[in-house]
């Protein structure tokens, strides 16, 4: 007869491991018992269990409640056992020793491999600001057995670097993603992808990039100076900028206080019916936690009567 087993049994942490051992005997041969032992190199054999043809399953106190026979129907020549709730410490070499009569004893070894799936974590780097050089955007760490693979999935241009730390029964892999921050990266996803044989599918953790910036400020509303004449209603100046975090706006007048009746509404400065009093230099001040910008414009309110008077003068002069 001969023993049938597997060279390697692979199981995920917490699952049950079936340790196979089947005696394929000649007719008339019987199995008296099957002894299972752990036989790691450098250590003596430690018995897990003994399956006795007459007196049933005996289990080592060290494995109490963890070793069972597979559910029925059972073949009397099958010496397989189930090791419940595999832990990392179970990884190693096991020996199945089958005592038969009249043929004698047979033994076979297998290796139990316990996969420890990783629990990845993503840590964002320091605050990203436009104008910085190459900066850490995020690091992703995953520990498992065997060592997991850590990669990045993103449309953002950057560089990655990985390092690995070996522990006694596992390995931790850390991958870092570096980039040169620019405003176009704002809101873009950066996804850490962890692959491992103990995972049914890759694990993904997504971090949304936030890059602090503040665009140059400009003022709109003075495109047609001729519209800024005495008596005009609904005149307004609008301050244009953008930033992350979103900026706040403040309006001042360089050559004095804001005239009465002028309304400040965030980025917009609204004027009552225009008078020459509204002529002056107006400053829009834009700021966020990252930076601040100023833009100034000169408002010159025209007096149509003055203009027509000049025209008459010019005509008469000709």
């Amino acid at each position: 007869g001969e023993l049938e087993t597997s060279d390697v049994v692979t199981v995920v942490l917490g699952q049950d491991a079936k340790l196979p051992c089947f005696y394929r005997g000649d007719s008339g041969e019987q199995v008296g018992q099957v002894a299972w032992a752990r036989v790691d190199a450098g250590e003596g054999a430690q018995e897990l269990a003994l399956l006795h043809s007459k007196y049933g399953l005996h289990v080592s106190p060290a494995y109490e409640g963890r070793v069972e026979q597979p559910p029925p129907p059972r073949n009397p020549l099958d010496g397989s056992v189930l090791l419940r709730n595999a832990v990392q410490a179970d990884e190693g070499e096991y020996e199945c020793r089958v005592s038969t009569f009249p043929a004698g004893s047979f033994q076979a070894r297998l290796r139990l491999r316990v996969l420890v799936p990783p629990l990845p974590s993503l840590n964002p780097g320091p605050a990203l600001e436009e104008g910085q050089g190459l900066t850490l955007a995020a690091s992703c760490t995953a520990e498992g057995s065997p060592a997991p693979s850590v990669t990045w999935d993103t449309e953002v241009k950057g560089t990655t670097s990985s390092r690995s730390f070996k522990h006694s029964r596992s390995a931790a892999v850390t991958s870092e993603f570096h980039l040169v921050p620019s405003r176009s990266m704002n809101g873009q996803p950066l996804t850490c992808v962890v692959s491992h044989p103990g995972l049914l599918q890759d694990q993904r953790i997504t971090h949304i990039l936030h890059v602090s910036f503040l665009a140059e400020a400009s003022v709109r509303g003075l495109e047609d100076q001729n519209l800024w004449h005495i008596g005009r209603e609904g005149a307004m100046l609008k301050c244009l900028s953008e930033g992350q975090p979103p900026p706040s706006y403040n309006w001042t007048r360089l050559d004095g206080p804001l005239p009465s009746g002028v309304r400040v509404d965030g980025d917009t400065l609204g004027f009552p019916p225009l008078t020459t009093e509204h002529s002056g230099i107006y400053v829009c001040h834009v700021s966020n936690e990252f930076s601040s910008r100023d833009s100034q414009v000169t408002v010159d309110v025209l007096d149509p009567q003055e203009d027509s008077g000049k025209q008459v003068d010019l005509v008469s002069a000709s």
Epitope: G32, Q33, A35, A37, A45, Q46, E47, L48, A49, L50, H52, S53, K54, Y55, H58, V59, S60, P61, S99, F101
Partner: nanobody, 118 residues
Framework: EVQLVESGGGLVQAGGSLRLSCAAS????????MGWFRQAPAKQRELVTS???????RYADSVKGRFTISRDVAKNTVDLQMNSLKPEDTAVYYC????????????WGQGTQVTVSS
């Protein structure tokens, strides 16, 4: 041939403890399982617990959690620690040894009486 000698029986109150010991001599190299059987009056002999040379154990459901078997292969002894004894544990307890050649218990001690009073 294997000779087995038990000791440690006696009378004990319900809830008490007793320890039985068994020493083997003779052809001890052929011993596989060692165990303890018991036989109450007018009942069949039953296997209480057995232990392999490698220390794997089996207990009858009726004694699980109360009885503990231990074996010293070097000294050829097997002990049975009995805790939380009940009147229904009253019986003659036999040490037994199983031969590697036969795979059944074929060597027996003379038996020791355990009486649990309520």
């Amino acid at each position: 041939e294997v000779q087995l000698v038990e000791s440690g029986g006696g009378l004990v109150q319900a809830g008490g403890s007793l320890r039985l010991s068994c020493a083997a001599s003779g052809s001890i190299s052929s011993i596989n399982l060692m165990g303890w059987f018991r036989q109450a009056p007018a009942k069949q002999r039953e296997l209480v617990t057995s232990i392999s040379p490698g220390g794997s154990v089996r207990y009858a459901d009726s004694v699980k959690g109360r009885f503990t078997i231990s074996r010293d292969v070097a000294k050829n002894t097997v002990d049975l620690q009995m805790n939380s004894l009940k009147p229904e544990d009253t019986a003659v307890y036999y040490c037994a040894a199983e031969s590697e050649r036969t795979y059944y218990f074929d060597s027996w001690g003379q038996g020791t009486q355990v009486t649990v009073s309520s």
